[in-house]
């Protein structure tokens, strides 16, 4: 006996079309673009039913259901807006992702996604992955362009990248992105195999304040060219945090230098160092201090450190020097690992040019200078570590 005439589901069609369907005859269902074959909620690759000898089809009719991309996934540090209509997530619907203003900016694409026939939200570039809200770097409340000696008190938001590192000794670092800290290798060398021993604090001005954002280290990466207790060449390290920190006006990453950054770091250009290191009174600072200091001619600095007790070649091409010939303004013990920052007048963002590394025994001494790791020499190293881990 013939099987019942197959009625195509809405937005679908039957093939082949026959006057009647008898034993072993079959039909398939094909859906229009933007509609998918569904049995329940599960997608079917194809659908073919066969007429059985009892005059019934061997499979129930599927549905041709409009493709529904479903509620879009949450975007960390961002939000999503339904453009087509409130909660509309079906074929050709449009949504717009955006990042939390001021502190995050969108990477990868423009944030506009369309629900495509394959059931996935897809960007105009064809990407099915979420955009990325990347922290904006180099924002500071300051409008003017580890070791702070002869400095001034910092105000909230002046140095939001400043990180206090406790673990054996007091040191500093600078926040990169939202889960990395840039610091000096010598400051964290002892903890390289025990990263969890590092107590990392940010978002505070007062060294002893109980009000701070706590972060913990997942791993410490010391530059492979750094040799402990044998000079300070390659005195640079990265700390990976075990969680992303929330960016706000008091916690903001510092920018890495662009290729053009050296034009803002010539001799006599002013950089700013900040930290809780020893002050003129000989104690660690309670309040975050900062000092504006000029870059010193490299040859001049090399010469200053060629006299005993400094071994020849103490100052290398991987270092830069800053300070006043007359002394009085310097970084000092406790400031190690902090950032020497410069204002990029083109982007109006602050970037890290140096890392507080070493200097004369007597901070702020005339004719001696603070020596900083030259960050621009290590951009490939930094980028490789961050992309690999």
């Amino acid at each position: 006996q013939p099987c019942p005439y197959p009625m195509a589901p809405p937005n679908g069609h039957v093939s082949p079309v026959q006057a009647k369907y008898i034993l072993k005859d079959s039909f398939s269902i094909f859906c229009e673009t933007g509609y998918e074959l569904l049995q329940g909620h599960l997608p079917l690759k194809s659908f073919t039913a066969v007429c059985q000898k009892d005059g019934s089809w061997d499979r129930p009719m599927p549905a041709c259901s409009i493709v529904d991309c479903g509620p879009p996934d949450d975007l960390p540090s961002g939000r999503v807006e339904y453009i087509t209509g409130p909660g509309v997530t079906t074929y050709k619907a449009v949504i717009q992702y955006s990042c939390e203003e001021t502190f995050y900016t969108m990477k990868v694409n423009d944030g506009k996604y369309v629900c495509e026939a394959d059931g996935f939200w897809t960007s105009s570039k064809g990407e099915k992955s979420l955009p990325v809200c990347e922290p904006v770097c180099g924002l500071s409340a300051r409008t003017t362009g580890g070791r702070i000696y002869g400095g001034q008190k910092a105000k909230p938001g002046d140095f939001p990248w400043q990180v206090l590192i406790l673990g054996g000794t007091t040191a500093a670092g600078a926040l990169l992105y939202d889960n990395w800290v840039l610091t000096a290798a010598h400051a964290v060398y002892e903890q390289k195999h025990d990263a969890s021993a590092l107590d990392i604090r940010m978002g505070t001005l007062k060294r002893l304040s109980p009000h701070y954002t706590q972060a913990w280290s997942e791993a410490v990466f010391i530059h492979e060219g750094y040799t402990h207790d044998a000079g300070f060449d390659n005195d640079i390290a990265l700390i990976k945090l075990n969680n992303k920190v929330v960016i706000n006006s008091n916690i903001t990453p510092i920018c890495l230098p662009r290729k053009e950054a050296e034009s803002f770091m010539r001799t006599d250009d002013i950089g700013t160092a900040s930290g809780w290191g020893l002050t003129q009174r000989g104690f660690l600072a309670r309040n975050l201090m900062y000092v504006d200091i000029p870059i010193v001619d490299h040859q001049k600095c090399t010469a200053a450190y060629e006299k005993p007790p400094y071994p020849r070649g103490s100052v290398t091409a991987n270092m830069l020097c800053a300070g006043l010939e007359s002394g009085g303004k310097d970084s000092c013990r406790g400031d190690a690992g902090g950032a020497l920052v410069f204002l990029d007048s083109e982007t109006e963002r602050w970037f890290v040019g140096g890392i507080v590394s070493w200097g004369s025994m007597n901070c702020g001494e005339a004719g001696q200078y603070g020596v900083y790791t030259k960050v621009i020499n290590y951009i490939p190293w930094i980028e490789n570590i961050i992309s690999d881990f």
Epitope: L42, D74, D118
Partner: antibody, heavy 118, light 106 residues
Framework: QVTLKESGPVLVKPTETLTLTCTVS??????????VSWIRQPPGKALEWLAH???????SYRTSLKSRLTISKDTSKNQVVLTMTNMDPVDTATYYC??????????WGQGTLVTVSS | QPVLTQPPSLSVSPGQTASITCSGE??????AYWYQQKPGQSPVLVMY???QRPSGIPERFSGSNSGNTATLTISGTQAMDEADYYC?????????FGGGTKLTVL
């Protein structure tokens, strides 16, 4: 971002009932064609699908375990619960909850190891 | 429930192509899905609906499915691809997994 986290006892006695909870975030249990699946993996063995539940409350179970399994969801708590009665040592496994999307199981929890022993 | 059969193990040298097969009756009529599982970790979806790569999965992973066999191909295999791989399909609203293939990168 999308996360799923399993919770429940790590040790169950034979004949007891196992109750596992999957807490989800980053997606909705009430809208779209999203589902949550439970899958288990005995030590050193292959993955075994157990059950799933969709936003519409459509449920499905592994045929051989159908009489022992119950899956449900609490949308307000963003939770999916699996109960498995009459536990046996052969049910010792890591139990995963995972999201179903476009037929694929695209996000998995970290899994919870359940040992059945007296 | 229908059975999906995978070879228990497969060894390839770095840079070579690995082809992991999954066979089942009329599997080509259904969508095949593939998962990668590294020791001590949860599985990761590496291929959906036969040949679609989820975001974040390298282009060296590709898939095909016809007749009775679905294949996951890894071209230019890397050491990091060493893992167990499982195929999966849906049959009448129930999921079926293959027995898994242990891929060793020599």
């Amino acid at each position: 971002q999308v996360t799923l986290k399993e919770s429940g006892p790590v040790l169950v006695k034979p004949t007891e009932t196992l109750t596992l909870t999957c807490t989800v975030s980053g997606f909705s249990l009430s809208r779209g064609k999203m589902g949550v699946s439970w899958i288990r993996q005995p030590p050193g063995k292959a993955l075994e699908w157990l059950a799933h539940i969709f936003s519409s409350d459509e449920k499905s179970y592994r045929t051989s375990l159908k009489s022992r399994l119950t899956i449900s969801k609490d949308t307000s708590k963003n939770q999916v619960v699996l109960t498995m009665t009459n536990m046996d040592p052969v049910d010792t496994a890591t139990y995963y909850c995972a999201r179903i999307r476009a037929g694929g199981i695209d996000y998995w929890g970290q899994g919870t190891l359940v040992t059945v022993s007296s | 429930q229908p059975v999906l059969t995978q070879p228990p193990s497969l060894s390839v040298s770095p840079g070579q192509t690995a082809s992991i097969t999954c066979s089942g009756e009329k599997l080509g009529d259904k969508y095949a899905y593939w998962y990668q599982q590294k020791p001590g970790q949860s599985p990761v979806l590496v291929m959906y609906q036969d040949k679609q790569r989820p975001s974040g999965i390298p282009e060296r992973f590709s898939g095909s499915n016809s007749g009775n066999t679905a294949t996951l191909t890894i071209s230019g295999t890397q050491a990091m691809d060493e893992a167990d791989y499982y195929c999966q399909a849906w049959d009448s609203s129930t999921a079926v997994f293959g027995g898994g293939t242990k891929l060793t990168v020599l």
